[in-house]
């Protein structure tokens, strides 16, 4: 940029050095050179000489006009052609920027990750503004009426120590830049309702050598929340479609979940949990890959259809990953999946 240029004259921009993208812009150059009556005044944008829409206003001043200026940033400078000088003489330079006023922040969400000591609020910023844009997060207690403000660029973490006075808050976000300001919708937050349990981790899996082999997946969390509802999704690595099982979990001990799976196949498992009856889910855990053992019998294997499994139709979802390399990105499909339970034996995956 041209921030510390020694000017021998002046350069100014109408409507201003930062303006709305797509506006018509006039840039003026006025020389104040000693011992020079310029033959010509020249404009340069990002180092390249401009040829068109230049008007000489008087002996000392010229203007360049841009229709619908749409570059986020440009470095403008102007020069004079002085008689008897081989090179052009620099007059002045300016950084100019164009951008957009901010969109109203949308999809404002606030959560407390268990043990983090923070309330984390995120939002969608909307279309790019191309200029410095800040977000002012307002947090107002519905009990004491006290309001706090936090400055953010894309998200904010607010220490729960500063939220001691009350449990219920109103949260909203203002997007501000030099071209405008917009407010998000207000979000009602009860601190007890936005806690996401400590991360759930799949620690290991094993496939038994029974006549009908079963895979047991072991998973755990350090959460102190008593009532936790979880989903485990799984699929073969060659498949795009996930199957999902639901569980009510009690993490005072390691969870064990049983699956009747295709033999000699590589499966990927992921788990996520939420406090029972609440809205916010953990992100899916890291993918855990397990290879089921080879089939020993000759019987035609039909998962979910063996005499050893009860068929119970559940309202659960089937999801399709966009790409096998991106297991976190998926689109929901409307489907019913059959959730299998072994006919006998101790199991903890009823839910």
């Amino acid at each position: 940029g041209i921030t510390s240029i020694n000017c021998s004259g002046d350069m100014w921009v109408e409507p201003g050095e930062i303006f709305q993208m797509g506006m018509n812009v006039s840039i003026y150059c006025q020389e104040a050179l000693k011992h020079c009556r310029p033959r010509n005044l020249y404009f340069y944008k990002n180092g390249f000489k401009e040829e068109f829409d230049i008007t000489r206003i008087n002996r000392t001043t010229a203007r360049i006009w841009y229709k619908g200026f749409s570059e986020p940033h440009a470095y403008m400078h102007c020069t004079a052609e002085c008689p008897g000088h081989f090179q052009e003489t620099l007059i002045c330079g300016k950084d100019i920027s164009s951008g957009h006023p901010p969109d109203a922040p949308s999809n404002l969400t606030c959560v407390i990750y268990e043990y983090s000591g923070n309330m984390t609020c995120t939002w969608n910023t909307g279309k790019p503004t191309y200029i410095d844009t800040k977000y002012i997060v307002h947090v107002k207690s519905l009990e004491t009426e006290e309001e706090q403000q936090y400055l953010a660029s894309s998200y904010v973490k607010i220490s729960t120590d500063s939220l001691q006075g009350s449990r219920k808050y109103l949260v909203w976000v203002q997007a501000v830049n030099s071209l405008g300001m917009e407010n998000s919708q207000q979000l009602h937050v009860h601190l007890d309702d936005i806690v996401i349990p400590s991360a759930s981790i799949i620690s290991r899996a094993e496939t038994t050598n029974d006549t009908v082999p079963k895979t047991i997946v072991y998973w755990k969390s350090k959460t102190m929340i008593e009532k936790v509802f979880c989903e485990m999704r799984y699929k073969t690595t060659t498949n795009q479609t996930w199957s999902v099982k639901e569980f009510d979990a009690n993490f005072t001990y390691v969870q064990q979940s049983e699956f009747y799976l295709e033999p000699d196949s590589k499966y990927v498992f992921q788990v996520r949990c939420q406090e029972t009856g609440k809205r916010n889910w953990q992100p899916w855990s890291s993918p855990f890959v397990h290879q089921t053992s080879q089939e020993t019998g000759k019987r035609n294997w039909q998962p979910w259809s063996s005499p050893f499994v009860h068929q119970t139709s559940q309202t659960v979802s089937q999801v399709t990953a966009k790409s096998s390399h991106e297991p976190q990105k998926m689109e929901m499909l409307s489907a019913t999946i059959f959730r299998g339970h072994p006919a006998s034996g101790n199991h903890q995956d009823i839910g």
Partner: nanobody, 116 residues
Amino acid sequence: QVQLQESGGGSVQAGGSLRLSCAASGYTYSSCTMGWYRQAPGKERELVSMVFSDGSTFYADSVKGRFTFSQENAKNTVYLQMNSLKPEDTAMYYCGCATLGSRTIWGQGTQVTVSS
């Protein structure tokens, strides 16, 4: 911890001018995004003007063309020049220092009263 002290408020007739000052101490306010805010009785505190790292300045629609934000880095001071004042500009005016991720720090405020 930065401390902010506003001054320059007072009573003025509609159409008059005032210049508010805000002096920062405690540490250089260069790490702050500085803003002027105001709160009228029974209303929420609202942002009046804020300066950005690219040198640009935001002005609320209600003050555009009448108020000017300026700063004097050597004195750790920011100013709000208020011209063509209107009765609806009557409020307590605060300057604020905001750093990313931190709670905004306010001064004690200075009262501006505009009578018609």
